[in-house]
């Protein structure tokens, strides 16, 4: 199945050229998306190409600049945020990245009414997080791990927390592990819908062991980076949730929200907070052994000035076959009655589907069903529920947007996107305005991405927001590889794969094969999306066949496949890559003497284990920033899938599943090991231990480190990395330079 739309081929073959590595490294064929910054039901902001901030009104068709590029440039602003009362804009500059989501910045407040920056009581710098209240122009911000509140931008700040300390106590922002593995945000504070209350998390990392690594920099002595980082089985952060009345915060003070008794009885996590109304909040908690989650709905008791979380409003979600949820436990989307909600969790057949919970989880009404999965609930209005799923035509790697009419009985379902641009667009996300009056659809492929604006009532397309015309023109004379998505049926397991084939692919010839693997729990690599990347180049220019395979442990195909790896990481993911390779060889066009595998992060772990599987299938392979032992990785992530590294739990498999344990098996493969020395996520320690084990086993291998680079190996390191890996693969496959 060729997923890329066919182009009119230029009759002169010589005008068509293959992709070059330079194209990839320069981002020549990158695409744009358009996500409106919604500010009402019918208005959105967008930063124009010349950096003006423009307000668009869909209904009047008018647009005007609310903030000029001159004002933006005056403080070197790279981002902005309009206050809900439209009186002020914060301008963000001096962006300084910390971890995956977190960064610090300098903030300036611009008063739109007088066209001047607010002077007096300016914000301190650098700020770790800043946001407007949902109504009006109150500001909450985090500075030096403490939370501050301003009633108006020009007012002095009120300090809400005082115990914030670097690497010890985090208020309103997550520590490393909560940021990366639980919240997936840079913030840990949440305004109530009308801005009356502010909820925040406090993370106490006092007892967490610290990972320390050298940052070489340019100085005479390297400095040491210290991060409280709980590895599997280690002491975890202690979390508490507080809520403060922002109208008169100095009086009552922060109120702690009680943890459900069944959660508080042992180590636990806070997983998310959802405001329902100004006086009702929903908190989600998770046991450290992550198969029990509790959703707790709490109400403000005016007479007591406290938050009450009755046991009758606790909803338990438990998994008996794996961990709770998919990658994360899903969050609820509340309906207009402010007590019932919609939530995605496994049905009795083991597929993740939307359920409607009115009183108890046991009495939940299943809204979607089938041998496919509901993936995200975008919006619930009074009469419609919008969600995405991979139902259409039974392709797990697609995403279409559906509308269920919940206002009528029986509810009717309509696929909003399935037939819009069927060849070009099979993988969508959406962004909705207030009350879903309008929405933007962003199509990621398999054709060239396109973003469109739609009427929320009729689903009619109003206009194209971004269609990547320049990219389309630029690709006209490029010989792109062919892509196909198909499946293998092996021992009652369905293995979906994506194969990227050279432009002049001929089934009667033999091609070198490169397996690109990630394979982490609840991941998906085989997706109907557009990409012109390194593997596109390898197929286009170097004539390789590249394959991506979703094996056991991957997502959106039911719990049987997903939870197959529970407590057994490093076994079935590897087996399934090997099985797929054997099937590819049977197809007849693979040169079985030239097969390689490569992966990054979890993929580096899988590629390493595959190379050391002793099958003789792989000639060579690359591991970038691999995990090498689950004892070295973060508690929240690792224990979700592996349990604890204790004798009475799962220590044995922790020990059996290391890369080091298989050092001997690398003897007959060419192995390239790559890691950044300042990797805060998968610590350099992982590769250091692989290297040590290989040296001790007297096994030859190649290695490359990237000084002061993190898990992303960005900037100039990216160019060096892909150039280096290209040389390695070409050498392995005996391809001329």
């Amino acid at each position: 199945i060729v997923l890329r739309p066919s182009r009119v081929h230029n009759s002169e073959e010589n005008t068509m050229r293959a992709l070059t590595l330079k194209d990839i490294l320069n981002g020549t064929f990158s695409y744009k998306t358009f996500f409106p910054n919604w500010i009402s039901g019918q208005e959105y902001l967008h930063q124009s190409a010349d950096n003006n901030i423009v307000l668009y009104n869909i209904e009047t068709g008018q647009s005007y600049t609310i903030l000029s590029n001159r004002t933006m440039k005056s403080v070197n602003a790279s981002n902005y945020g309009l206050s809900p009362d439209r009186q002020f804009v914060y301008l963000e500059s001096d962006y300084s990245k910390l971890w995956r989501y977190s960064y610090t910045a300098t903030y300036y407040i611009y008063d739109l009414s007088n066209g001047e920056f607010v002077r007096g009581n300016e914000l301190p710098r650098p700020i770790q997080y800043l946001c407007w209240s949902p109504v009006g122009s109150k500001l909450a911000y985090v500075y030096q791990n403490n939370i501050y509140l301003k009633q108006r931008p020009g007012d002095p700040p009120f300090q809400i927390t005082f115990n914030g300390r670097e690497n010890k106590i985090f208020n309103g922002i997550p520590d490393w592990v909560y940021e990366e593995e639980m919240l997936a945000t840079k913030y840990a504070l949440w305004w109530s819908p009308n801005g009356k209350f502010l909820a925040y998390a406090e993370f106490n990392d006092t007892d967490i062991p610290v990972i320390a690594y050298s940052y070489y920099g340019d100085e005479q002595y390297p400095r040491t980076i210290n991060i409280p980082y709980p590895k599997a089985g280690a002491k975890n952060p202690v979390v508490r949730i507080f809520i403060i009345d922002t109208t008169y915060p100095a009086y009552v003070g922060p109120q702690e929200v009680p943890v459900p008794a069944m959660i508080a009885s042992s180590d636990y996590y806070f997983s998310w907070l959802t405001w329902v109304t100004d006086e009702r909040v929903c908190l989600q908690w998770l046991k450290r052994v992550q198969n029990v989650s509790v959703l707790s709905i709490c109400d403000f008791r005016e007479d007591w000035q406290t938050w009450d979380c009755p046991k009758t409003q606790e909803h338990i979600e438990e998994s008996r076959t794996g961990w709770a949820g998919g990658f994360f436990v899903s969050t609820p989307v509340f309906s207009y009655d402010a007590i019932s909600y919609y939530k995605i969790f496994s049905d009795k057949d083991g597929y993740k589907h939307i359920h409607y919970i009115k009183d108890t989880v046991e009495n939940a009404i299943q809204i979607t069903s089938g041998k496919w999965e509901a993936i995200n609930i975008f919006r619930v209005t009074q009469d419609s529920l919008f969600y995405s799923s991979n139902e259409f035509e039974e392709y797990p790697g697609r995403r279409n947007i559906y509308r269920i009419s919940i206002g009528s009985y029986p509810p009717s379902k309509k696929c909003v996107t399935c037939h819009l641009r069927k060849e070009r667009c099979q993988y969508y996300t959406a962004s909705f305005s207030d009350y879903a009056k309008y929405y933007a659809l962003v199509c990621y492929g398999p054709g060239i991405p396109i973003s469109t604006l739609h009427d929320g009532r009729t689903d009619q397309e109003i206009k194209i927001l971004e269609e990547n015309k320049e990219l389309e023109n630029a690709l006209k004379n490029i010989q792109l590889p062919k892509e196909e998505i198909k499946k293998l049926e092996v021992d009652e397991i369905t293995l979906w794969y994506k194969m990227i084939l050279p432009p002049q692919f001929d089934r009667s010839k033999k091609y070198p094969l490169l397996i690109q693997v990630y394979g982490g729990p609840c991941s998906q690599s085989v997706r109907s999306v557009f990409a012109v990347n390194w593997i596109s180049y390898l197929a286009s220019k170097e004539g390789m066949v590249i394959a991506l395979v979703d094996g056991r442990g991957t997502a959106f195909q039911g719990d049987k496949l997903l939870y197959a790896v529970y407590r057994k990481l490093g076994v079935y993911e590897v087996e399934d890559q090997i099985t797929a390779v054997r099937k590819f060889i049977e197809m007849g066009f693979i040169d079985e003497k030239r097969i390689a595998i490569w992966g990054w992060s979890y993929g580096g772990y899988v590629s390493s284990l595959a190379l050391a599987s002793g099958t003789g299938l792989f000639k060579c392979g690359i591991a970038v920033a691999p995990v090498s032992s689950w004892e070295y990785y973060a508690s929240v992530y690792t224990e979700r899938f592996m349990g604890l590294p204790t004798k009475d739990d799962n220590l044995e498999h922790y020990k059996n599943s290391t890369v080091m344990a298989r050092a001997e098996y690398f003897r007959n493969v060419d192995y390239l090991l790559i890691h950044g020395t300042a990797d805060d996520n998968v610590h350099f320690q992982n590769s250091a231990q692989i290297a040590k084990a290989l040296v001790n086993a007297q096994v030859d291998f190649q290695a490359m480190w990237y000084s002061d680079q993190n898990h992303g190996l960005s900037g100039l390191s990216t160019n060096h990395l892909y150039t280096h890996m290209t040389h390695f693969l070409k050498q392995c496959f005996s391809l001329s330079d």
Epitope: F158, Q159, Y248, Q255, T306
Partner: antibody, heavy 117, light 108 residues
Framework: EVQLLESGGGLVQPGGSLRLSCAAS????????MSWVRQAPGKGLEWVSA????????YYADSVKGRFTISRDNSKNTLYLQMNSLRAEDTAVYYC??????????WGQGTLVTVSS | EIVLTQSPGTLSLSPGERATLSCRAS???????LAWYQQKPGQAPRLLIN???RRATGIPDRFSGSGSGTDFTLTISRLEPEDFAVYYC?????????FGQGTKVEIK
Amino acid sequence: EVQLLESGGGLVQPGGSLRLSCAASGFTFSSYAMSWVRQAPGKGLEWVSAIISSGASTYYADSVKGRFTISRDNSKNTLYLQMNSLRAEDTAVYYCAKGWFGGFNYWGQGTLVTVSS
Amino acid sequence: EIVLTQSPGTLSLSPGERATLSCRASQSVTSSYLAWYQQKPGQAPRLLINVGSRRATGIPDRFSGSGSGTDFTLTISRLEPEDFAVYYCQQGIMLPPTFGQGTKVEIK
């Protein structure tokens, strides 16, 4: 009716210790931040310490930091102030008050602490 | 810390007169964080004007608070005999919370 009743004051030598208590009634004690405020003889009011409703966070004036400890027992509806290393300048009437940093809407009648040799 | 300066130190007035008490802060406070208290000899202070210029429960409407930024005023529109006492302003925007030194309103 809201009532705050302090006890535990008295005469103590410099360097000595005292523990003040404040028994609360007439409101949901466990829901409110509480403070201690003192008043030296013939002088103005000085905030000493505060504690949030759950007891999770405590706050102190620089003049007492490291010497005084505020705590609460929500099951007993009681607020405490443990005063160690007392000095002559700690001599004052000590009031317990309902509130965190401001808007102290209920006060006890006060207990006198005299630090003298 | 924020220093609150009250003026005048003493205010001598007759019952029925209007009393205007001033409180100046060393840095901006805003009315959301400023309160006023009344204290009579041998008694505990009593909250008059809560943060946000709101009259506390049970306080007669002859008492009112106003002001913003650094300048605040407590006004007693018509002094009653029971109003002769010491009045304190207090800020709660910054730790430590601080009180003014007090204004004594005495019978002329």
